[in-house]
């Protein structure tokens, strides 16, 4: 019986070139948490497991920091990193987990004030 | 290639006990999940035990545990299934499977199996 | 426990037909389904994960869709090689279950 929830951040945003923290947290449930996935759409970014630690996907390896916790964190914001997070929990004796995070990465300020003042 | 051969099968009493090994080669061993699966006579697939990659956690289904004890030999590249107070519905082809490193429930990679008979 | 059930638990069809198997989770497993190919004297392979992604090796003319309870396996373009039992099986909660099977033939 899966007793447990899934708290997340929610929807967050952030600036482009900037980094977030994407967190989520599994409560109510007495249940071994064995891995925790985090991935972007269909794509897999990290891995946390009970036994061997952190694996960050490699094509995310410039970008992508374990932790916080169980945490991720995405460094150098593209607006292309916008779109909804998942972190899977992987727990005994419940099962799986879910969690949904929507990032939105919008043009910095400091950006839009470079763009407008352009020297030809 | 991916390599498991199970051996240890055979014909056992009501109450007996049986030890099976599941030899891997192909693939580093010690960073994978590995379970067993059973295939009764009337073809039907059982998951009956899971191991994680490091040997510090293991899980059951009711059927099986508290009789049934999974471990392993990462030094030897070794699997192993203790059966006792085996019973006749204990009766089956006996499969060692690696896990998905991404996904705990996948079995990836299975060996070809060895037959356990419990009859008096 | 979760139940996986499969329909048809057996099926004719002639090559280069396109089939589809069907399974049914007695609960939402989301999209943790996988499906495996046991050809007659062998043992389980796995051919897709997580509903819809194809394992390595496995030729384009098997697909996987669904989520939630209702699960599809459709092989196109029917192989004499495609003649085996195919299984689903849930990864949502433990204990892992499996379907009881489809059985393929070729007429």
């Known amino acids: 019986m899966m007793t447990g929830t899934i708290e997340t951040t929610g929807n967050i945003s952030a600036e482009k070139g900037g980094s977030i923290i994407l967190q989520c947290h599994l409560s109510s449930t007495t249940a071994q948490v064995t891995q925790v996935n985090w991935e972007q759409q269909d794509q897999l970014l990290a891995i946390c497991n009970a036994d061997l630690g952190w694996h960050i996907s490699p094509s995310f390896k410039d970008r992508v920091a374990p932790g916080p916790g169980l945490g991720l964190t995405l460094q150098s914001l593209t607006v292309n990193d916008t779109g909804e997070y998942f972190c899977i929990y992987h727990t005994y004796p419940d099962g799986t987990y879910t969690g949904r995070i929507f990032l939105e990465v919008l043009e910095s300020s400091v950006a839009e004030h470079g763009a407008r003042f352009q020297i030809p | 290639e991916v390599k498991l051969v199970e051996s240890g099968g055979g014909l056992v009493k009501p109450g007996g006990s049986l030890k099976l090994s599941c030899a891997a080669s192909g693939f580093a061993f010690s960073r994978y999940d590995m379970s067993w699966v059973r295939q009764t006579p009337e073809k039907r697939l059982e998951w009956v035990a899971t191991i994680s990659s490091g040997g510090s956690y293991s899980f059951y289904p009711d059927s099986v545990k508290g009789r049934f004890t999974i471990s392993r030999d990462n030094g030897r590249n070794t699997l192993y299934l203790q059966m006792s107070s085996l019973r006749s519905e204990d009766t089956a082809l006996y499969y060692c499977?690696?896990?998905?490193?991404?996904?705990?429930?996948?079995?990836?990679?299975w060996g070809q199996g060895t037959s356990v008979t419990v009859s008096s | 426990d979760i139940q996986m059930n499969q329909s048809p638990s057996s099926l004719s069809a002639s090559l280069g037909d396109t089939i589809t198997i069907t399974c049914h989770a007695s609960q939402n497993i989301n999209v943790w389904l996988s499906w495996y190919q046991q050809k007659p004297g062998n043992f389980p392979k796995l051919l897709i994960y997580k509903t819809s992604n194809l394992h390595t090796g496995v030729p384009s003319r098997f697909s996987g869709s669904g989520s939630g309870t209702g699960f599809t396996l459709t092989i196109s373009n029917l192989q004499p090689e495609d003649i085996a039992t195919y299984y689903c099986q849930q990864g949502q909660s433990y204990p892992w279950t499996f379907g009881g099977g489809t059985k393929l033939e070729i007429k």
């Open positions: 499977a690696r896990q998905d490193y991404r996904y705990p429930y996948i079995m990836d990679y």
